[in-house]
Interface confidence: low
Amino acid sequence: SAPGEDEECGRVRDFVAKLANNTHQHVFDDLRGSVSLSWVGDSTGVILVLTTFHVPLVIMTFGQSKLYRSEDYGKNFKDITDLINNTFIRTEFGMAIGPENSGKVVLTAEVSGGSRGGRIFRSSDFAKNFVQTDLPFHPLTQMMYSPQNSDYLLALSTENGLWVSKNFGGKWEEIHKAVCLAKWGSDNTIFFTTYANGSCKADLGALELWRTSDLGKSFKTIGVKIYSFGLGGRFLFASVMADKDTTRRIHVSTDQGDTWSMAQLPSVGQEQFYSILAANDDMVFMHVDEPGDTGFGTIFTSDDRGIVYSKSLDRHLYTTTGGETDFTNVTSLRGVYITSVLSEDNSIQTMITFDQGGRWTHLRKPENSECDATAKNKNECSLHIHASYSISQKLNVPMAPLSEPNAVGIVIAHGSVGDAISVMVPDVYISDDGGYSWTKMLEGPHYYTILDSGGIIVAIEHSSRPINVIKFSTDEGQCWQTYTFTRDPIYFTGLASEPGARSMNISIWGFTESFLTSQWVSYTIDFKDILERNCEEKDYTAWLAHSTDPEDYEDGCILGYKEQFLRLRKSSVCQNGRDYVVTKQPSICLCSLEDFLCDFGYYRPENDSKCVEQPELKGHDLEFCLYGREEHLTTNGYRKIPGDKCQGGVNPVREVKDLKKKCTSNFLSPEKQNSKSN
């Protein structure tokens, strides 16, 4: 557990007056319909709110939307609907906010049936002004910004055309027809799949994967017989139909599709699927669906090339129907992921890994909790976390697990304590050490958010009745204080705080309902006066991440290095501040065989850390080929785990084997790769 001070609750004095002076109400002059909210830029304080209201008439639906803008984190809003000529904005497209702090916003308008194309409103000054632009096509998807240049936009049309703009939506050009899916890659590259015969659906498995690196001046076909493709980290993945049957297999490229390797993963049939659960520049977590409608599959983790995969977790819950998985990256601690497995008795259990998928384990039972009715042994059970699957099943779970990179070690989630996930009303649990230990934080379901990099946690009870009370904690959820933010309770619809958890403002959204009318209302509370002073050096304490056994000389070593953080003391009530940077001191660990995975053609026998050569690979389902053709491939049987930084210690050296003879692939032959120009 992270360093905790005394368990006594240090109360914040005079907090009611401090918060009352910093609570701002805004009543929106709108009928209740739907509301969507977007932050424009980082640390700008600019929020856009779009309210929409549908009036169902006999012949048509009359729609009305209003646009509001705040530049003080939601304390005050100004109606700017006139800037978009009082046009009805299509909510299914949302508000397309530009990357980084570009200040760009695109809103897609509803247009009448007979029009030649759609209409957008564009702003490049954080929504102070908008320019109306009529499009030469009807958009099918939201405008997608190039991550490298926010002036470059792409969109698909309802006619399956791929359209590109080079001047932030002012002018548009159709660069290709018959396009199913398009994505920006790195360096303003666009990847897209095309169909030749009927349609995207009809040609599934016979699509071509194309690439343009110059916004449509020239193209290269980089894949054929494509079912789908995806980008993750520096990897480009394509699932490709096999020659002989209806199975398909993953191929991977790390050079934007110029060369491909067959991933050492099982092939899948028509009813199965692959899913990239998480990816970074080092490696990828890949889910491979089990045959049949089982609702589970296997997680594999890749090597640094994305080619060789190690089985990470069996019976991983991933429903075919709703496409729900509980897989969660715990962003507050390196290497930690949480997900659910479907056990043999069809109960759902939570598993956690602290080493990027190397080993999975159950979550430790919280000290202050009893095992529930699902537990066979009342003294031995685990914490099980409610995530996407529970939410999809309409269990009383208002929020998925929450963690923030700058609130080191903190994870907040709904859960139940037993042998499996329970359908009973969950409680809220917190971990302050990245998931190693847990404590019950709040009774019953709540909405929660992290402010000031963990300096404040805010929660609101999930209730069907109107509410007027907010809870807050300044000691990572140990002690809570309640604040009545309004005399008149509201029907609560959501908590909103600026992404990144650096803000000290929280907005409570809801509506008031009276006999004749209902209106949207927001309350924005600024906690700056609760955290009166800036944190100083004495407010922080050293904490070794992943520490489980201080007597072990490799304590804290994960992926070859350990990290010591400076963390805010629980007893310190002070501001980390918007410019807070996590202070961490890494130190390299000695290598052991645990820091290596087995290369292609090698495996680890049960309970052995050594990689031994597979006697014969012929007839194996796991074919392998580097770059899609016979290649001189040499290996010593070991490969450093992606992202592992260990040095010294064990350096597995053994005879280098030539695996050329074991190389087979049925993917693109070079002659199928042709270049085309417009």
């Epitope: 070794l544 000389y553 490799e554 052991s592």
Partner: antibody, heavy 129, light 107 residues
Amino acid sequence: QVQLVQSGAEVKKPGASVKVSCKASGYTFTSRYMSWVRQAPGQGLEWMGIINPVGGSTSYAQKFQGRVTMTRDTSTSTVYMELSSLRSEDTAVYYCARDPSGIAAAGPASRYYYGMDVWGQGTTVTVSS
Amino acid sequence: EIVMTQSPATLSVSPGERATLSCRASQSVSSNLAWYQQKPGQAPRLLIYGASTRATGIPARFSGSGSGTEFTLTISSLQSEDFAVYYCQQARLGPWTFGGGTKVEIK
């Protein structure tokens, strides 16, 4: 009780190798590191290196790099120290010592150091032609 | 590597008297320091770890202090069984290093 039992005394010729064993009992072998320390006649203590029984990773003092090899056998809870290319100045008593902590390669030490809390009885190695 | 220097090399003390042994590190070792006692023909025995914490079974007359580069081992009232050689050892950065030792002899 916790104890480390070392192999018996050895007499070796210069240029030869010696392999000293250290068998642990009374605790979980893989839960603690093992250091090797030697003491030449009438001299002080000299740390040679450390091994992690879990993965077998090692760290050796620069002076012994290339001549010393530390290994372990988890099935018998035994750690071995082999010193090659022996010279007369390698004549010493060699101790294995349970070492609950280890090396912070960079930055502030991540935690408390608990000291070498259990020592073997020592193995006398004499190098003489 | 971090060099540990012990002083004095020999300390002559009468039984019942106080003995103060010093250990200096060439750079800060924080509190990652241990003290050992060694009697002739025996293996060393851990006395103090973490610069100031007595190991299990060590009498209260032994105490350690200091942090950073300066450390002290104090034996408040020497008993006959305390006459031995005492070593300090750092574990701040590899390689671990020992001081040259202080021999406490009967005056």
